[in-house]
Amino acid sequence: IPTEIPTSALVKETLALLSTHRTLLIANETLRIPVPVHKNHQLCTEEIFQGIGTLESQTVQGGTVERLFKNLSLIKKYIDGQKKKCGEERRRVNQFLDYLQEFLGVMNTEWIIES
Amino acid sequence: IPTEIPTSALVKETLALLSTHRTLLIANETLRIPVPVHKNHQLCTEEIFQGIGTLESQTVQGGTVERLFKNLSLIKKYIDGQKKKCGEERRRVNQFLDYLQEFLGVMNTEWIIES
């Protein structure tokens, strides 16, 4: 019997829930939520989850929309755990430079960079 | 005449400088710097630049190694600017949900997720 279902599966399910409950969530016509103006999503996790909190407080709870917010809260928990792991291990300069090079390489190839 | 060199060019130059000055940078055998234990680099920008600060304070300055740290500081400035843009614009719920869906989609396909 599996001991844990991976976060990737949680994300997939959450996408399906989000798609289903979209109509209910957009019912509030007056609500405004901060939306990042670029696509480097990982830089904006704090603001994204603040927005989710705002949305949750303004949404009529009950039934399966609760499940969506539960999943989103578990995703936040996962990301918070990842953030904790940013500074946990102290290594030699060599290993730090490997990581820095990798970070810049990813920035070079994958980030959406405007001047 | 161009008014600004794009960040993408700055990143490319920095990668080259990093490669050139690696030997000088790893000269300090005793120095230990926090290194993230996962590859979701954008979540760790704060810790990465703290590490760069530590490294700079322990590195003999002069010549082109100074250029490397200047570039890294400009990259930090760019990222700080991007982080500011995470919460600047308030939009309708619909647009927030588009961004959230995109974020989860990216998480689903591009993040390195361990259970």
Epitope: I5, L10, G63, T64, R67, K70, N71, L74 | -
Partner: nanobody, 119 residues
Framework: QVQLQESGGGLVQPGGSLRLSCAAS????????MSWVRQAPGKGLEWVSS????????YYEDSVKGRFTISRDNANNTLYLQMNSLKSEDTALYHC????????????WGQGTQVTVSS
């Protein structure tokens, strides 16, 4: 104690159908959201489909949409997965799962039933 017991798996040819069942006991079945997850040989667990406690909302992973149908019978504490147009990539051990605790995701699941799609 909580028990989830799957059945209905087997060997089927591509394009064929199967109906999986999951008998639940030890908790108030009708109060809980239920799901099917699967694990293909050498792969990680994958979410397949979910259903709300009253059965009014159903959700599917993109690759099974239009081919699989999840349903439940709250009177008999049973969860179902009707699988049509089966493909070789559906070969996996299928588990039904639920979560009884607020801060966890699928904390209870069954032993699983094996589905093999092969000609």
């Amino acid at each position: 104690q909580v028990q989830l017991q799957e059945s209905g798996g087997g060997l089927v040819q591509p394009g064929g159908s199967l109906r999986l069942s999951c008998a639940a006991s030890g908790f108030t079945f009708s109060n809980y959201y239920m799901s099917w997850v699967r694990q293909a040989p050498g792969k990680g667990l994958e979410w397949v489909s979910s259903i709300s406690s009253d059965g009014s909302n159903t959700y599917y992973e993109d690759s099974v949409k239009g081919r699989f149908t999840i349903s439940r019978d709250n009177a008999n504490n049973t969860l179902y997965l009707q699988m049509n147009s089966l493909k070789s990539e559906d070969t996996a051990l299928y588990h039904c799962a639920t979560d009884l605790y607020d801060d966890s995701w699928y904390d209870h699941w069954g032993q699983g039933t094996q589905v093999t799609v092969s000609s």
